[in-house]
């Protein structure tokens, strides 16, 4: 660490005195101090001398000696007072700039330590400090306003009591700047705009910040627009607003509009798209397939996306049949607005009943006309099976009827013993019927198929089973020949109730 001679923390001299400050270190040393006149600097190897033969109050201050080559960065300091009876203050700067909540040091240095007891801080023209101003004083450094606030941006003077009268320093202007957290906050409304050619439109770009120093502009397809700016201050924020008013829009007004604001922290921008159309439009679409298949008893939501300008004048869901004249309950229909020109309409169909299969249509209307989007809802059913014994063309025949959706496949099984359902160990023969006869196949209804199994002789200690299956499930019917005739019954586990 460098050593200063004289080796005292502070030195008090009179104006006109000769002052010599010598600093010695292991290597080269350097002096730093307040800007002041009359000093002569002489350096020689590891020592450096600051001297003046005519000290003035302006030489008052702290002089620090450092050794640039010292990795520990050690330093030594001495404070010099040049006590001028006419000049109690040496003001090092007439403007101080700090950020809010920082300590603000007003650098009025007392030229005579004896005066410390009678110092005070005032605002210019003798006005008292604002309430809640918390400050302290150091004769070496000046007055510190602690945790300075924006409202304390004022002109201050340091006051010292000399011979019973107050002597003021020159004024020091304090500028307390708002802490700017980032680029200005932006809003651009609307987020999207559609107009028919000839209509009026308005786009508003606004930016706000805690600091007034920011710029905002609106650009159309990368061309900056010349728009008068409205400025305001509320909620402790500065606001700048640009409003673009278009009385009669045309196609050249369409395109991308960007609202851009910038300050020292950076830039923010937000964009919107303006569409100009020739006439009103209404488009309906769905992300779903318009042909829907759902298992009976399950639920379904039908969704329609609507793009429209101008806005919708009416809309509704309608059931077009074929089963009944019931209409969807309004409580099951709901609308959500994605944005100004796009909406989603949903029809909820919980626990679907057989009578609810059919066509559902969403209708919407705006000045562009009516549009409709129709869904076809088919219900899926597991097969229901029945078997009867009959004679066809004189031949004994087992006739199996299976009804379900999608169309069931039919398999016949012959197994030993009397059983409700053939299991693998009992099976004697299996016949697949790849092409059962379709008895009925109407839209939105079950498909009924019939399969015939010609049996020359019914074996009495055997069971004949008709099995039907589709993507939903399966059903079966066991036929047991008995001496008194034939006995048929469905398996106990299959009792279908729609």
């Amino acid at each position: 660490i460098p050593v200063i001679e004289p080796s005292v923390p502070e030195l008090v001299v009179k104006p006109g005195a000769t002052v010599t400050l010598r600093c010695v270190g292991n290597g080269s040393v350097e002096w730093d101090g307040p800007p002041s006149p009359h000093w002569t600097l002489y350096s020689d190897g590891s020592s450096s001398i600051l001297s003046t033969n005519n000290a003035t109050f302006q030489n008052t201050g702290t002089y620090r000696c450092t050794e640039p080559g010292d990795p520990l960065g050690g330093s030594a300091a001495i404070h010099l007072y040049v006590k001028d009876p006419a000049r109690p203050w040496n003001v090092l700067a007439q403007e101080v700039v700090v950020f809010e909540d920082q300590d603000a040091l007003l650098p009025c240095l007392l030229t005579d330590p004896v005066l410390e007891a009678g110092v005070s801080l005032v605002r210019v023209r003798g006005r008292p400090l604002m309430r809640h101003t918390n400050y302290s004083f150091s004769p070496w450094h000046g007055f510190t306003i602690h945790r300075a606030k924006f409202i304390q941006s004022q002109d201050y003077q340091c006051s010292a009591l000399m011979g019973g009268r107050k002597v003021m320093s020159i004024s020091i202007r304090l500028k307390v700047q708002k802490v700017i957290p980032g680029p200005p906050a932006l809003t651009l409304v609307p987020a999207e705009l559609v107009r028919i050619r000839g209509e009026a439109a308005q786009i508003v770009c606004s930016a706000s910040s805690v600091d007034v120093n920011f710029d905002v502009f609106l650009q159309h397809n990368n061309t900056k627009l010349a728009i008068p700016q409205q400025s305001d201050f509320h909620n402790n924020r500065y606001q700048k607003v640009l409003t673009l008013n278009l009385d009669q829009v045309d196609f050249q007004h369409a395109g991308n509009y960007s609202c851009v604001a910038s300050n020292v922290q950076g830039k923010h921008s937000t964009s919107m798209f303006f569409r100009v159309v020739e006439s009103a439009y209404l488009n309906l679409s769905s992300e779903q397939n318009l042909i829907q298949e759902v298992t009976v008893g399950e639920g379904l939501n039908l969704k329609v996306m609507v793009e429209a300008y101008p806005g919708l004048q009416g809309f509704n869901w309608t059931y077009l049949g074929p089963f009944s004249d019931h209409q969807p309950e309004p409580k099951l229909a709901n609308a959500t607005t994605k944005d100004t020109y796009r909406h989603t309409f949903t029809l909820s169909l919980p626990r679907l009943k057989p009578s609810e299969a059919g066509r559902y249509s969403f209708l919407a209307r705006n000045p562009g006309g009516w549009r409709a989007l129709t869904f076809e809802l088919t219900l899926r059913y597991p097969p229901e099976v029945s078997v009867i014994w009959t004679f066809i063309n004189g031949s004994g025949t087992l006739l199996c009827a299976a009804s379900g959706y999608p169309q069931p496949n039919v398999t016949w099984l012959q197994c030993s013993g009397h059983t409700d359902r053939c299991d693998e160990a009992q099976v004697l023969q299996v016949w697949d019927d790849p092409y059962p006869e379709v008895l009925s196949q109407e839209p939105f209804h079950k498909v009924t198929v019939q399969s015939l199994l010609t049996v020359e002789t019914l074996e009495h200690n055997q069971t004949y089973e008709c099995r039907a299956h589709n993507s939903v499930g399966s059903g079966s019917w066991a036929f047991i020949p008995i001496s008194a005739g034939a006995h048929t019954h469905p398996p106990d586990e299959f009792l279908f109730t729609p």
Partner: antibody
């Protein structure tokens, strides 16, 4: 080794505010004065002003009404704002360490600022 | 403010020659607060001399400064190719700090 680096927009529109930041690396910003100097193309150097790390400032009287300097010791940065700029403010702007007895001993490499619409 | 006037405006010399650059102040400047800078094309100025006669760190001893009051001189004893540049004097003792208009040292 202390290094200084100026940053800010290279293009500013007339009547707007020029904002520049000088970042000090390789050493502390504390306990020194820091100055801004500018140099129009092909011309000499003009001192704009200086700031101490406590926030004390001294400005060139010719620019005083338009200049604000500030310091952020936590980021080792100091800043310059010059308001109501005109084409005459087009220049290379330098930041420098300002030593009471040793002049401007460290300089940034400079940043060109053009004032144009 | 203190006005500094440098002369000559341009100085044409050959490598190896001696260069003498002058700086005159409109009022007395303490020699403690007079500096000289070198600026090469496209670069920032570099401190050569402070306190009228003290060489800054890393500056070759062919550069020397002298003078007091209102007249100051920068001397380059033996010009090297890299010395051809613009030189500015500056006073930093009185606000506002001011620079001379510069002397361009060019190869003859």
């Amino acid at each position: 080794q202390v290094q200084l680096q100026e940053s800010g927009p290279g293009l500013v529109k007339p009547s707007e505010t020029l904002s520049l930041t000088c970042t000090v690396s390789g050493g502390s910003i504390s306990s020194y004065y820091w100055s801004w100097i500018r140099q129009p193309a092909g011309k000499g150097l003009e001192w704009i002003g200086r700031i101490y790390t406590s926030g004390s400032t001294n400005y060139n009287p010719s620019l005083k009404s338009r200049v604000t300097m500030s310091v952020d010791t936590s980021k080792n940065q100091f800043s310059l704002k010059l308001s109501s700029v005109t084409a005459a403010d087009t220049a290379v702007y330098y930041c420098a360490r300002d030593r009471t007895f040793y002049a401007f001993d460290m300089w940034g490499q400079g940043t060109m600022v053009t004032v144009s619409s | 403010e203190i006005v500094l006037t440098q002369s000559p405006g341009t100085l044409s010399l050959s490598p190896g020659e001696r260069a003498t650059l002058s700086c005159r102040a409109s009022q007395s400047v303490s020699s403690t607060y007079l500096a000289w800078y070198q600026q090469r094309p496209g670069q920032a100025p570099r401190l050569l001399i402070y306190g009228a006669s003290s060489r800054a760190t890393g500056i070759p001893d062919r550069f020397s400064g002298s003078g007091s009051g209102t007249d100051f001189t920068l001397t380059i004893s033996r010009l090297e190719p890299e010395d051809f540049a613009v030189y500015y004097c500056q006073q930093y003792g009185s606000s506002p700090y001011t620079f001379g208009q510069g002397t361009k040292l060019e190869i003859k």
